[in-house]
């Protein structure tokens, strides 16, 4: 417990102190007091630096004194032989003796008392920044007018904090400006503007005079600006050393002015204003900004439009433009949106053709469609190449976004027909010689494939059976072989309107307009054994002359049997119509004069007994195309004849091209179109 006074005596005092002893006393007086320690008797073995025996006085880490020898008072009125005054409330006294004493020494007697200290004057460091007031056992600090005592109860400062500026424009100065600012102060000013505005501070050099930095460059008094995580300063010196215009990029600014105890100058004055927060003019690739400005600020809205061939995509949908707003944080909204190349996607496949796998499906990419050659060709020669257009479609220069059509190549047999042996008088043939040949099983007859959906035949073949079963692609019509060939299913039969329907067809003598079309349910796939024959052109080039050769094919009656199982064919010339008229009808069902001959009929045959016969009806009389020798066209259809092995009559197809085209057009599916 601290005491106000006390006595300290060496061991055995006033008898001689023992050898080899060490004893210490800890003196403590109350806080706010110093200690007055005085010795009234001192008799300790003398040695140099009191190395043998000594009494030591220690305050904290400091030795206040070390005593030995004999002392007597200099003052006849005072018993004090040695004294110490310390301004601290703790003191340690240590007595030490060595192993021997040459004489008898009696030691020491000492007393201590608590004494008041003057904190205001007794220390090198003044405890108060302004006024220091001493009292017994302590002191207190006080401040001049307009200053206040800080929480540390020692320092005085001016009350210059707490101001919050919210106006869009304002002026702030250091206390007393332009008179010297107060010492030992920390002034904090806050500027808080509406979100979307940045604080801009402006200072003039001459409006700034703050105590200069020390030799190490540290400001003794300083002005600092803090905006979020950015700091400007500290600034000090004569004339403002920083930028005269500070764009803080923040709507909140803290101004901190700190001063020390000395070196007051006139201080500073600044102006601030709120600028709409700027947003950077970003370089967004593949797009244009509207309106275009040198500077964009808070609340500005731009329309960002993608260049042709670019779009903004979200999920499965896209847009070619979007809006972006300069926001209160100085950043653009929708900055995640980027104009990227339009993707036309995987190109659609086409019937009877293919598209090569594109390296890319993005804007500007090119793809090429091809048809399955040699059986199909592209309807439009320039229809093969498509590029990915800005609207996200694959586009062709001629067809636009429409897909190309692969249409069957007509009139080109895979293998040319070669007569080996002398239908009647004809030769064996292979279906590859006549891939257009269609077999009708009831009645046993023929027809010609003219495209994917249509078969041309004679009207008399289908007048009695409007749902005929047809086959393509087989040389043999044996039942077992037909099972493996392609069966065609009719959707509708169209008989020429000029064909006269009879109650008893067997007695027919008028075969005028003996032509019909069969519309198929499903398209026929072309190949080496199945492909169409061409139709004649409308020009005079396709007018037949006597002697022009044509090919006929079918499974009709031969010399040896009523029906052929394997395909037969013959080459025969066109003859004048009178040649057919002159032949006597074999089994007339009427008077010979009753048989009708018209310009819609072609007469052919008469050479070496080669002719078509019962069972060949509807098959094509194929003539080489005068404008393209590689192709055959259907000049005629096997219709009727006076007598097998002589001359035969064929429907003149050229006269019906308009009807054929019109019928097909009016009855096509959208896919065909």
């Amino acid at each position: 417990e601290p005491t106000m006074y006390g006595e300290i005596l060496s061991p055995n005092y006033p008898q001689a102190y023992p050898s080899e002893v060490e004893k210490s006393w800890d003196i403590e007086v109350p806080e706010g007091y110093g200690i007055h320690l005085y010795f009234t008797h001192l008799d300790i073995e003398l040695s140099e630096n009191c190395a043998y025996d000594s009494v030591q006085i220690i305050s904290g880490d400091t030795e206040e004194g070390r005593l030995c020898g004999q002392r007597s008072s200099n003052n006849p009125h005072s018993p004090i032989v040695e004294e110490f005054q310390v301004p601290y409330n703790k003191l340690q006294v240590i007595f030490k003796s060595d192993f021997s004493n040459e004489e008898r020494f009696t030691g020491f007697a000492a007393y201590y008392v608590a004494t008041d200290i003057n904190e205001c004057t007794d220390f090198v460091d003044v405890p108060c920044s302004h006024f220091c007031n001493n009292f017994i056992g302590g002191y207190f600090c006080s401040c001049p007018p307009e200053y206040f005592l800080h929480d540390d109860m020692k320092n005085c400062g001016v009350n210059c904090s707490g101001d919050v500026f919210t106006a869009l424009i304002g002026e702030i100065a250091s206390p007393n400006y332009p008179k010297p600012y107060p010492e030992n102060s920390r002034c904090e000013y806050q500027i808080r503007l509406e979100k979307g505005f940045q604080v801009v501070v402006t200072l003039r050099r001459e409006d700034f005079d703050v105590e200069a930095a020390d030799s190490a460059g540290n400001c003794l008094d300083s002005l600092v600006f803090v905006a979020g995580d950015r700091q400007f300063g500290p600034y000090c010196g004569h004339g403002f050393p920083g930028p005269l215009n500070i764009e803080t990029k923040s709507n909140a600014l803290d101004i901190i002015f700190q001063t020390d105890l000395t070196g007051q100058k006139k201080g500073w004055k600044l102006r601030y204003h709120g600028d709409p927060m700027p947003c950077p003019k970003e370089d967004t690739p593949n797009s244009v900004w509207e309106p275009a400005k040198a500077k964009y600020v808070f609340r500005d809205v731009v329309q960002i439009t993608c260049l042709d061939g670019f779009e903004v995509v979200e999920g499965r949908v896209g847009a070619t433009s979007f809006y972006s707003t300069c926001q209160s944080n100085g950043k653009w909204s929708n900055s995640k949106l980027k104009c990227q190349p339009v993707d036309c996607g995987i190109p659609e496949s086409i019937e009877n053709g293919k598209v090569e796998d594109p390296e890319s499906t993005l804007f500007g990419s090119v793809i090429r469609y091809t048809c399955e050659e040699p059986y199909y060709y592209m309807e439009n020669e320039e229809g093969g190449e498509y590029h990915c257009a800005g609207n996200g479609s694959w586009v062709n220069e001629v067809l636009g976004p429409e897909l190309p059509k692969c249409v069957p190549v007509c009139g080109v047999p895979r293998e040319p027909f070669e007569e080996k042996q002398r239908i009647i008088g004809g030769s064996d043939a292979d279906i590859k010689n006549f891939p257009w040949q269609v077999f009708f099983d009831n009645p046993w007859a023929g027809g010609a494939l003219i495209n994917e959906y249509w078969v041309l035949t004679a009207a008399h073949v289908v007048e009695g059976n409007r749902e005929p079963t047809m086959y393509v692609g087989s040389t043999s019509v044996q039942t077992s072989r037909l099972a493996k060939s392609k069966m065609l299913t009719p959707e509708h039969v169209f008989i020429h309107p000029g064909w006269k329907l009879l109650e008893v067809p067997e007695g027919r003598t008028n075969f005028d307009n003996d032509i019909a079309l069969v519309r198929l349910k499903d398209p026929v796939k072309m190949g080496p054994t199945v492909s169409p024959i061409c139709l004649p052109g409308t020009s005079s080039d396709y007018n037949l002359m006597d002697g022009d050769l044509g090919l006929i094919s079918g499974w009709g009656r031969t010399e040896k049997r009523d029906r052929a199982v394997r395909l037969k064919a013959a080459r025969l010339p066109v003859a004048p119509l009178r040649k057919c008229k002159e032949v006597k009808v074999e089994k007339p069902t009427a008077d010979a004069e009753a048989y009708v001959f018209t310009p819609n009929m072609i007469c052919a045959g008469g050479e070496k007994g080669m002719d078509s016969c019962k069972g060949d009806s509807g098959g094509a009389f194929a003539v080489q195309d005068p404008n393209d020798k590689t192709k055959f066209y259907a000049a005629g259809l096997v219709s009727w004849g006076p007598q097998c092995g002589t001359y035969g009559l064929y429907t003149r197809v050229k006269n019906y091209v308009d009807w054929i085209m019109k019928t097909m057009q009016e009855n096509s599916t959208p896919r065909e179109d």
Partner: antibody
């Protein structure tokens, strides 16, 4: 497929805070904005604010400024909305939504009831 | 802030009817306007974006038009599943604001 799954319903006392989570799957939230929209009972939709999870930029509607905090944890692909100093008029269904061009996907909603 | 005003507030119609809902912005929002459909107890669903583009999977009977301040959502032939509340929303500038909604009920 794209999904936003929100945390369950909450009952809070006035003055308290609530934190609603929105876990995304089927996409990376860093590539989108994550919005929060609320709907008081029998009322319309009210946009509260958004976050760009890529850089934690946020924009709040003035009405909620100072009371709402939207955050995102890109490691768990989750967005959060915290509303403090709750009052009875904050009783609503809170939705998170994903956007670039528009609010194409929404969470199922979280009912927050504020009652003493 | 931009205010969005929808009209009518509610509307009764029959299956097969043609219905039009309008939305007016307090200032020009160009074409930055979206339409949403919300059924009771469900989250809103996007129907139309950028004023006139139908979102993927939305039936063709829904169409949007307009630019600037006046916008329209049209349902050409109402189906039973279309009875719901419809909201417009501007995404021209933050804060993104919604209309107060139009409740479409069965007559």
């Amino acid at each position: 497929q794209v999904q936003l799954v929100q945390s369950g319903a909450e009952v809070k006392k006035p003055g308290a805070s609530v934190k609603v989570s929105c876990k995304a799957s089927g996409f990376n939230i860093k590539e989108y904005y994550m919005h929060w929209v609320r709907q008081a009972p029998e009322q319309g939709l009210e946009w509260m604010g958004w976050i760009d999870p890529e850089n934690a930029d946020t924009i709040y509607a003035q009405k909620f400024q100072g009371r709402v905090t939207i955050t995102a944890d890109t490691s768990t692909n989750t967005a959060y909305m915290e509303l403090s100093s709750l009052r009875s008029e904050d009783t609503a269904v809170y939705y998170c939504a994903r956007s670039r061009l528009f609010f194409a996907y929404w969470g199922q909603g979280t009912l927050v009831t504020v009652s003493s | 802030d931009i205010q969005m005003t929808q009209s009518p507030k509610s509307l009764s119609a029959s299956v097969g009817d043609r219905v039009t809902i309008t939305c007016r912005a307090s200032q020009d929002v160009r074409t930055a306007l979206d339409w949403y459909q919300q059924k009771p107890g469900q989250s809103p669903k996007l129907l139309i974006y950028s004023a006139s583009y139908r979102y993927s999977g939305v039936p063709s009977r829904f169409s949007g038009s307009g630019s600037g301040t006046d916008f329209t959502l049209t349902i050409s032939s109402l189906q039973p599943e279309d009875f719901a509340t419809y909201y417009c929303q501007q995404q021209y500038t933050t804060p993104y604001t919604f209309g107060q909604g139009t409740k479409l009920e069965i007559k």
